[in-house]
């Protein structure tokens, strides 16, 4: 099934909106990259998965 992401960042940069972030996270791999490439901290993203 499709992976749906519920993610909340502590801060937004580069004029991002939560909606734009959600649109970017279309796969678990994207989520992994956001989490480990861009944030660098487990405290920066509070996320859960639902299918």
């Amino acid at each position: 099934g499709n992976l749906k992401h519920k993610c909340f960042r502590n801060s937004l940069e580069n004029n991002e909106t939560l909606e734009s972030i959600m649109n970017t996270l279309e796969s678990e791999e994207d989520f992994r990259k956001y989490f480990y490439y861009l944030e660098g901290s487990k405290d920066a993203l509070l996320c859960g998965f639902s299918t």
Epitope: E16, E28, R32, Y34, Y36
Partner: antibody, heavy 117, light 113 residues
Framework: EVQLVESGGGLVQPGGTLRLSCAAS????????MHWVRQAPGKGLEWVSV????????RYADSVKGRFTISRDNAKNTLYLRMNSLKPEDTALYYC??????????WGRGTQVTVSS | DIQMTQSPSSVTASAGEKVTINCKSS????????????LAWYQQRLGQSPRLLIY???TRESGVPDRFSGSGSTTDFTLTINNFQPEDAAVYYC?????????FGQGTKVELK
Amino acid sequence: EVQLVESGGGLVQPGGTLRLSCAASGFTFSNYWMHWVRQAPGKGLEWVSVIDRGGGGTRYADSVKGRFTISRDNAKNTLYLRMNSLKPEDTALYYCTRDRNGEYDYWGRGTQVTVSS
Amino acid sequence: DIQMTQSPSSVTASAGEKVTINCKSSQSVLYSSNQKNYLAWYQQRLGQSPRLLIYWASTRESGVPDRFSGSGSTTDFTLTINNFQPEDAAVYYCQQGYSAPLTFGQGTKVELK
């Protein structure tokens, strides 16, 4: 055929500015995270920057943070690297790379940046 | 940052020999959600761009000869070249794709004896 073609390198004085471009073709550019990786003469590979598929998320190596800006134009299938306040230690061959799943499955041929007075 | 350490820094091999290159990461590159190691190996021939050989520690990239193989998990990884060929003379790099800053090993130069 996937192709990544870098351009915009050259000789610049310390403190100067360059904008590198990477023209992508042969794949759906907007589906991929993209990176810049550089290689100083006779040295190893050094990661520079990454940008997410939509362009809203970016990150930089500490060595270039605050001086370099990565961006992309998905309508033009082009990746950019704006390089300000260039230093001699930025002298390198700059590669545009495609990120598949944490690995770089395609590399361009690179564009040479030389910072010297 | 995750540090990547390769050994040896250089090796000389004759055609037909087996070459082994090691790569150690300073912390785990195993992603628990999918149990994949985000470790890749590249070949860079003189004057050329790097070429992906192995990803996820042990998966051979399409078109790569089967004499190249990768193994290992968590923090310790190995690239093996069986039946070394003259065209395999190059510098080999490992790279972790687990977290930014993405980092490379310092490279291992493999020369033809």
